[in-house]
Amino acid sequence: QPPPPPPDATCHQVRSFFQRLQPGLKWVPETPVPGSDLQVCLPKGPTCCSRKMEEKYQLTARLNMEQLLQSASMELKFLIIQNAAVFQEAFEIVVRHAKNYTNAMFKNNYPSLTPQAFEFVGEFFTDVSLYILGSDINVDDMVNELFDSLFPVIYTQLMNPGLPDSALDINECLRGARRDLKVFGNFPKLIMTQVSKSLQVTRIFLQALNLGIEVINTTDHLKFSKDCGRMLTRMWYCSYCQGLMMVKPCGGYCNVVMQGCMAGVVEIDKYWREYILSLEELVNGMYRIYDMENVLLGLFSTIHDSIQYVQKNAGKLTTTIGKLCAHSQQRQYR
Amino acid sequence: SAYYPEDLFIDKKVLKVAHVEHEETLSSRRRELIQKLKSFISFYSALPGYICSHSPVAENDTLCWNGQELVERYSQKAARNGMKNQFNLHELKMKGPEPVVSQIIDKLKHINQLLRTMSVPKGRVLDKNLDEEGFESGDCGDDEDECIGGSGDGMMKVKNQLRFLAELAYDLDVDDVPGNNQQATPKDNEISTFHN
């Protein structure tokens, strides 16, 4: 074991080193002192450290540790932040295109429905966007509202254009009839199933990414305990007190210290692993009716089919609705 | 795998796709993200080692600091002595995680539970839950996979998926479209005239 520095040595080296941490030299002793007031760098002999220096070392050690932690998580943090933003934007683009496709379908196939259809389609896709972003909207209600709104327009414009401008009372009757008679066949339920499944998965995918960011941010900005600060100081700076400026901590010792300092953080490990594996499982299942891109961009076609279905069953429907909403229609004709 | 209005509007001018060199789909982007995330699966357990390897640690030197004294790198003292007579490391570990860490662990537990419940069971992509009757008409047979179910791999594979983040220029001009379904079917088919 090498001998400690001779007591007559000056603390010159320590001073110049400490000056980088703390401009102003008043805290460093001129020559080694007994250091009986030290609490962390407990001396075996004379020391070049004072209580104030020790405090500064602790502060610096904790700061170093925070910076190391931040640089350790930088790549991971950037990966999740970037992807969360990219996917959110991508999903918004998908919703926008899905709306355009649906509007185009109405414009090109059912021009007489367009003004109102555009409005209902717009409201539906606004709700879709809000849902993805976490809004408390029920998907079945969204789909029901879309078909409830569309049916009176389809009935009065496509199936029965002879009717005068539709008044509220027949519209209400038609909205009711839409559900009671299942006028769109199984298409609304089909859309509900596809849209709710794909949007739920999309929403949780985004939520998971955002939570990933929160996890990294939390561990990134951890304030380390005083005990940890002492351990780090002893490992990184106490050698300076003995004038050993160039010595480095032993590897095994560093690991023991880090495990002690990070005992709490490391507890996240189990749940973090599970998070990544669960996210992978979710992503593997995001296809067909669990893929919002697939579902939303194909929605215009299912809506088109549903209108064809109504048109093809128009005879039966018009007769039944004629009876069901006769009261409302008579009031209109008066 | 999504369908574009080319299905519906025969004139291909209706959909002007901005061609992207790498036709990156959302699903490929998702898979890529997962692969990258998986390389960070041991992130937290590896942190202590990472920080030691990124802070000054004796590697090639014969001597190293153990918290109290200079020792030979491979001696038992290298890890042990520095911890003697110091505050109790075991005590430090026993304190348990900080409240913020406990909080984030709870959130992770919750999202993991959600992710598990949302994950699609293997081999069961379509649920058998769409057996609602249409307007007085039959629809799904008893053992069909939904009403959309059934044709195996051909199911939803037509057309390329949205070119990832490529703005699809969409032309909504009716002029580009050859007729519309309201008139494109039999000319006399104004369904309204049937109830005269």
Epitope: G298, H304, D305, K312 | L8, C147, T193
Partner: antibody, heavy 119, light 107 residues
């Protein structure tokens, strides 16, 4: 021009299943419903059901629920009908037909597939 | 389900004659009716939809009429290619049903 090309004749044992195909060409397959119609030799026509190829949504005549299953493959523009638990009563010619899009009348028909169920 | 009753079940006529086939429905179907022609070993061919609208490519000697529950298909000046079976079908809504057919034979 619009064409519906059906698969060839089938000879099947009682209790077996057969899958008939109907390949569409000359139009956008996903824009129109495909119906299937049964005709027992020398007799009238019976509507079995229809499929909307785009969403693969199906509607059946109550009489044929459990007997026929309609599917479609968009990538090959082909509609399929599977008949199961065959009996001699299922021996017939089966047609696929395309409707007008917004009315249930059939302007285009396949050439028919003869299914013979015999022990 | 809507019942379709066609009459007569069979009919003999000569080239040049005019014939009428009728179809009665069990309930009012307004004008939602189609007529088809089928020749031996062939697929049906659409002649008329919406009770009176001639399908594309159908000769003008064919005409449909009626509404409600009574419908008829008239063929003026029969041609040799007109012989075969004729079916009515409602397109009022699912399930679709067809008439039993009328067999038109050469006298």
């Amino acid at each position: 021009q619009v064409q519906l090309q059906q698969s060839g004749a089938e000879l099947a044992r009682p209790g077996a299943s057969v899958k008939l195909s109907c390949k569409a060409s000359g139009y956008t397959f996903t824009s129109y419903g495909i119906s299937w119609v049964k005709q027992i030799t020398g007799q009238g026509l019976e509507w079995i059901g229809e499929i909307y190829p785009r969403s693969e949504s199906t509607y059946y005549n109550e009489k044929f629920k459990g007997k026929a299953t309609l599917t479609a493959d968009k990538s090959s523009s082909t509609a399929y009908m599977e008949l199961r638990s065959l009996t001699s009563e299922d021996s017939a010619v089966y047609f696929c037909a395309r409707d007008y899009g917004n009315i249930y009348s059939f302007a285009y028909w396949g050439q028919g597939t003869l299914v013979t169920v015999s022990a | 389900d809507i019942q379709m009753t066609q009459s007569p079940a069979s009919l003999s006529a000569s080239v040049g004659e005019t014939v009428t086939i009728t179809c009665r429905t069990s309930e009012n179907i307004y004008s939602y009716l189609a007529w088809y022609q089928q020749k031996q070993g062939k697929s049906p061919q659409l002649l008329v939809y919406n009770a009176k609208t001639l399908a594309e490519g159908v000769p003008s000697r064919f005409s449909g009429s009626g509404s409600g529950t009574q419908f008829s298909l008239k063929i003026n000046s029969l041609q040799p290619e007109d012989f075969g079976s004729y079916y009515c079908q409602h397109h009022y809504g699912t399930p679709l049903t067809f008439g039993a057919g009328t067999k038109l034979e050469l006298k």
